[in-house]
């Protein structure tokens, strides 16, 4: 037999909270358990589902879970079935709702001294207790001479008067919790003696020196009082106007007129209506003075043909907000087409060259009008006026390559030399028309040049080859004065270049021919053995057919090159003694001798009392000091050559003589003793 160990039992439950109906079964065979609600099988959902044999509720629902639940156990083999006791939920809940008018049937029927009943549509279980509020303040039964009665969910006002006007709301609570009205009811019961608005003044914007009118009307029984005040609470009447409102007039119907408005008249005006009873009704309106600021400047715009472009006109700040429109050539632009206005934007669709020109954005309001021009340039691809051409430029002279183009806007032209951008310097100049000037053409300027002319619309380029026409010139120019060593072999080179390889020959300046021991070999003058007679003036002549001839004059001197007869030696001297550095040189012309001590030339005129250079070239230093130590160089030079030789000078302390050393013992190094 099937036995219920645990049976479901009726229980309290809270709306939206968890619950469990327990059911446990014992049977000999295999049984399956299911649940019935009001006799119908219960289907599992996420909210309500079987858990073992029990029925679990994730969130109790007062509508879907009301009724009788029963646990059923069935043995599918024997067909035996057992049912539990019935169980149900006592579901506690509360749900907010609006405050509604129950009596009279509509708001329009509410009159002073009639009964008004409001209903609070908050429901719940168990039945809630209700509390009413007017303008947030709780109401209690019998309040205001028993005119208010709160019976359960209804609030009755009998009779209703102006003092009952306000915002009505309700709250309710029960064992589940509390809820307040989702929508409140505003009760408005007019008191004939209260001032009521018939016509409220509106904000106005006027231009300076124009007039402004504010309308204001109230009604009441008996008729109400009406008063106008300006910002500083100064009353405005036809009898007493404040100084800044001399031109104000208050009409019998309550309207206020201000004429020839000035900036000081701008501000807040208050119209106050006061009935026999009730609070004053204050209406406000502001008088604004119309104004319009200047417009920001436009940058000139450059567009390319075929593109779509927009130019936004930022309207100037103003009151009232200025209206904006675009004009071109004095004609207002349409709102559609190829060139049109869209909002504050000027739209140019598929730009044509003819669209170039000045467009004007206008802005206007009561205070006046402003305008700003924008210059629109339609860029064109450059076209050639003069392309660079292959050119022959003369060495040493200025050379020009032209790259003349035209376009809108004026094109940018850059030049390349051997694919390298050319910088402006002392040799290269690029004029704004695109012409390249090479100020002093050199041989290596002979190469490829390319110019590129561009605008935002596109670019064109062309290249040209420069051939440099070489000057007829000596390379290098011969030294004008040269020396040859007597009785030795000597050569004097002379070479030149030109457009054609020049012929080079030597001759004596006096026109006489070269002696037989002197040969002219392809421009090199060769002396097998120099004699005294070889000295003199010679001319190198370079010539070719197209460029004629050039001459270089050379004066040759025959000399005996310098040799040293006496050279200074490494010398050590006791401190305080005298040092002698000997130096003698020979040559023709007779050489002059100079000394260099410690990296500076010793000027004979500025040597001081301790140093002296003898006629024969020797250097004497008296009373030597340690700082005189160092390398001394003897330099011998004449108009043909220069030679030098050097030796160190050491200055040492004189040793104290020892007993063992006799007076004749020599020092361990070469010493000058004085």
């Amino acid at each position: 037999a099937i036995v219920f160990i645990k049976q479901p039992s009726s229980q309290d439950a809270l709306q939206g909270r968890r619950a469990l109906l327990r059911c446990e079964v014992e049977a000999p065979g295999l049984v399956h358990v299911y649940w019935l609600l009001d006799g119908a099988p219960v289907q599992d959902t996420e909210r309500r589902f079987t858990q073992g044999s029990s029925l679990s509720f994730a969130a109790v629902d007062r509508l879907q879970d009301s009724g009788t639940f029963q646990c059923v156990a069935r043995d599918d083999v024997t067909g035996e079935e057992a049912r539990s006791a019935n169980a149900s939920f006592n579901i506690k809940w509360i749900e907010a709702g609006p405050v509604v008018l129950k009596h009279p049937a509509s708001e329009a029927e509410i009159q002073p001294q009639t009964q008004v009943t409001l209903r609070c549509h908050i429901d719940g279980h168990p039945r809630p207790t209700y509390q009413w509020f007017r303008d947030g303040t709780p109401l209690s039964d019998g309040q205001s001479n028993n005119t208010v009665s709160s019976k359960e969910r209804n609030l009755t006002l009998r009779p209703a008067g102006p003092e009952h006007s306000g915002l009505y709301s309700c709250c309710a609570h029960n064992a589940f919790g509390q809820a307040c009205s989702s929508q409140n009811f505003t009760l408005s019961i007019a008191d004939e003696s209260f001032a009521r608005v018939v016509l409220a003044p509106q904000d106005v914007i006027v231009a300076r020196n124009e007039e402004a009118m504010f309308h204001c009307q109230f009604s009441a029984q008996p008729p109400p009082n009406l008063q106008w005040l300006f910002e500083d609470e100064t009353p405005i009447t036809n009898r007493s106007r404040p100084p800044h409102l001399r031109r104000a007039t208050v009409f019998a119907n309550g309207s206020l007129l201000l004429t020839q408005v000035r900036p000081r008249n701008a501000g807040v005006y208050r119209c106050i209506g006061q009935g026999q009873r009730g609070p004053p009704v204050i209406l406000e309106a502001t008088l604004h003075l119309a104004e319009i600021e200047d417009m920001p400047l436009f940058e000139p715009r450059v567009f390319t043909a075929g593109s779509e472009e927009r130019v936004t006109c930022l309207p100037p700040k103003g009151l009232p907000e200025p209206s904006v429109w675009w004009e071109h050539a004095g004609v207002r632009l349409p709102t559609h087409g190829r060139v049109y206005q869209k909002g504050h934007e000027l739209v140019l669709a598929s730009i044509a060259e003819s669209d170039a020109g000045v467009y004007t954005c206008h802005a206007a309001n009561l205070a006046g009008q402003r305008r700003q021009d924008v210059n629109i340039t339609v860029a064109t691809v450059p076209t050639w006026l003069k392309k660079p051409q292959d050119s022959q430029l003369e060495e040493g002279k200025p050379g020009y390559l032209h790259c003349l183009t035209q376009a809108t806007p004026k094109p940018t032209v850059v030049w390349y030399r051997n694919q390298m951008l050319i910088s402006e310097d002392s040799r290269f100049e690029v004029f704004k028309n695109g012409t390249l000037r090479i100020n002093n053409v050199e041989v290596y300027d002979g190469t490829w040049y390319r110019c590129v002319s561009s605008t935002p619309a596109g670019s064109i380029e062309a290249q040209a080859r420069v051939q440099v026409l070489e000057k007829l010139k000596f390379t290098p120019p011969p030294q004008p004065q040269q020396c040859m060593e007597f009785d030795k072999e000597a050569t004097v080179p002379c070479s030149a270049t030109g457009r054609e390889k020049p012929t080079i020959k030597w001759e004596r300046a006096d026109g006489s021919s070269l002696p037989e021991w002197v040969t002219d070999n392809a421009g090199t003058l060769h002396f097998a053995r120099v004699t005294r007679d070889d000295a003199g003036n010679y001319t190198c002549i370079a010539s070719n057919g197209p460029q004629g001839q050039i001459r270089a004059h050379v004066q040759l001197t025959v000399a005996v090159f310098i040799t040293f007869k006496v050279e200074p030696e490494r010398t050590t001297v006791y401190q305080g003694h005298t040092a002698l550095l000997q130096c003698e040189a020979q040559g023709d012309p007779k050489p002059l001798i100079q000394w260099k001590g410690k990296d500076r030339i010793l000027d004979p005129t500025k040597l001081g009392p301790r140093m002296h250079i003898f006629q024969n070239g020797s250097l004497v230093i008296h009373d030597v000091a340690p700082e005189d130590s160092g390398r001394y160089t003897c330099i011998a030079g004449n108009s043909c050559n220069i030679k030098h030789t050097e030796a160190p000078l050491y200055v040492v302390d004189k040793p104290v003589p020892e007993e063992s050393e006799g007076p004749g013992s020599p020092p361990p190094y070469k010493m000058i003793q004085t």
């Epitope: 000139p300 402006e424 004029f431």
Partner: antibody
Framework: QVQLQQSGAELVKPGASVKLSCTAS????????IHWVKLRTEQGLEWIGR????????KYAPKFQGKATITADTSSNTAYLQLSSLTSEDTAVYYC???????????WGQGTLVTVSA | DIVLTQSPASLAVSLGQRATISCRAS??????????MNWFQQKPGQPPKLLIY???NQGSGVPARFSGSGSGTDFRLNIHPMEEDDTAMYFC?????????FGGGTKLEIK
Amino acid sequence: QVQLQQSGAELVKPGASVKLSCTASDFNIKDFYIHWVKLRTEQGLEWIGRIDPEDGETKYAPKFQGKATITADTSSNTAYLQLSSLTSEDTAVYYCARASSGPWFAYWGQGTLVTVSA
Amino acid sequence: DIVLTQSPASLAVSLGQRATISCRASESVDNYGISFMNWFQQKPGQPPKLLIYAASNQGSGVPARFSGSGSGTDFRLNIHPMEEDDTAMYFCQQSKEIPWTFGGGTKLEIK
């Protein structure tokens, strides 16, 4: 060699105007664009505008439109910068510079100091 | 207008070391294969001197230790090795479109 010689320093009162000059030597200003640049220590360099002395065409930075007027006299090979309604913000060193159709400044004037002070 | 943002605002570099100054443009300054970005050096009391034109080309008489690189919107000026004489303000400048504009400048000093 190419030189741009600018006029001397100016001390001017607020609200007044001043006209600076830039005379070119060793080149013809008609062959180049002449630009003007403003230097203030804190703000750095600012491009004012340029003129094509050949046809008088000018271009200005929006900031200097209405403030600066650039002109040129080709007969004296001189470009001018006029500054109007001067305020302390206009106290600066003003340079003229030469550019060709390759848009870079290879040559500059030595600068003119303008001081605006009451 | 094309806005140029230079960084850093100031820089101290040891003698012999490398100094790098950056310049970023608010839009590309390239046109038909050329980057219209130039670099200037300015010393107190002197006009600016053109160091680099068209992003990477050395101005006339500018020592080889100054070099420029970059294209589009990002550019750099390199100085290596740094010398005493390089203490100055450095400005980038675009000449792709009017109005020509300058960067805010970088003050370069010896560390």
